[in-house]
């Protein structure tokens, strides 16, 4: 399956926080989305192979890494001034 953690996270002002996303499905592609209240999902970053990733529509204030196939952590940086949202990780073949 695919596992995201933590379920809830509070960020202190000026802090970077990292959301974990792990999958054991042998999927090449992984994605991070953001959903704000009353809105649809918006793509932040995606990765299609290990050590390669591309910006989505709203990448500013976020960073990612893809050091291994199974993992695609998202860092919400201090530059992200409005981080409060629902974050969703996904993967696909």
């Amino acid at each position: 399956g695919i596992t995201q953690s933590p379920k809830y996270l509070f960020r202190k002002e000026g802090q970077n926080v990292t959301l974990s996303c792990e999958q054991n499905l042998n999927h090449d592609a992984m994605y991070w989305y953001r959903q704000d209240p009353g809105q649809g999902l918006r793509l932040i970053y995606y990765s299609q192979i290990v050590n390669d990733f591309q910006k989505g529509d709203i990448a500013e204030g976020y960073s990612v890494s893809r050091e291994k196939k199974e993992s695609f952590p998202l860092t919400v940086t201090s530059a992200q001034k409005n981080p409060t949202a629902f974050y969703l990780c996904a993967s696909s073949i």
């Epitope: 090449d28 592609a29 299609q48 192979i49 290990v50 050590n51 390669d52 990733f53 591309q54 890494s65 893809r66 050091e67 291994k68 196939k69 993992s71």
Partner: antibody
Framework: QVQLQESGPGLVKPSETLSLTCTVS?????????WNWIRQFPGKGLEWIGY???????NYNPSLKSRVTISRDTSKNQFSLKLSSVTAADTAVYYC?????????????WGQGTTVTVSS | DIQMTQSPSSLSASVGDRVTITCRSS???????????LHWYQQKPGKAPKLLIY???NRFSGVPSRFSGSGSGTDFTLTISSLQPEDFATYYC?????????FGQGTKLEIK
């Protein structure tokens, strides 16, 4: 900052096995990425030999596959190259290398290179 | 294997010149994920190659803006807009779309 350092004999006899080790500092080789061996012939041409992945899986150049083994020692954070049945054509500078974050498979962390001469 | 052919093999130029090196692959370098894994390296005597450009046109960290890459499919170029004394070196293209990863034969850039 990832640093790589090759070690091994500089002279190997024909038909013997070339053995080199790459010691990695600044990053655990089990944490991610691909750990490559690349060689450069005296005429300056570059050839990718193969890699060992963070999970221990391998990918080799088919032209060398029957003679090459890349393995690792996770306790020492090292990976190694063995090339059997060498000939003078295997004389080259051998580099260990790994990719820079986010560049696909483009490598930019390199060892200093070790010159291996095959001669009796 | 994918053959990577660079031209010219050697090139004489002066400081301030605009220089273009081309690289042609024997097959398309577009990956199934639609990215193109074509890279450019610079090598100076006695040193390991250094990454300049990755994925066709992305300048690597710390690489001066005078270096740029372009192209698609099978045809790619590295351009140095205004040569500096430290740019005289050998340049290699490389592909990592297909295994085995392969390199061009190199272009030696010399002072005129």
């Amino acid at each position: 900052q990832v640093q790589l350092q090759e070690s091994g004999p500089g002279l190997v006899k024909p038909s013997e096995t070339l053995s080199l080790t790459c010691t990695v500092s600044g990053y655990s080789i089990t944490s991610g990425y691909f750990w490559n061996w690349i060689r450069q012939f005296p005429g300056k041409g570059l050839e990718w030999i193969g890699y060992i992945s963070y999970d221990g899986s391998n990918n080799y150049n088919p032209s060398l596959k029957s003679r090459v083994t890349i393995s690792r020692d996770t306790s020492k954070n090292q990976f190694s190259l063995k090339l059997s049945s060498v000939t003078a054509a295997d004389t080259a500078v051998y580099y260990c290398a790994s990719p820079s974050p986010g560049t696909g498979y483009a490598v930019d962390y390199w060892g200093q290179g070790t010159t291996v001469t095959v001669s009796s | 294997d994918i053959q990577m052919t660079q031209s010219p093999s050697s090139l004489s130029a002066s400081v301030g010149d605009r220089v273009t090196i081309t690289c042609r692959s024997s097959q398309s370098l577009v990956h199934s994920n639609k990215n193109t894994y074509l890279h450019w390296y610079q090598q100076k005597p006695g040193k390991a190659p250094k990454l300049l450009i990755y994925k066709v046109s992305n300048r690597f960290s710390g690489v001066p803006s005078r270096f740029s890459g372009s192209g698609s499919g099978t045809d790619f170029t590295l351009t140095i807009s205004s040569l500096q004394p430290e740019d005289f070196a050998t340049y290699y293209c490389s592909q990592s779309t297909h295994v085995p990863f392969t390199f061009g034969q190199g272009t030696k850039l010399e002072i005129k």
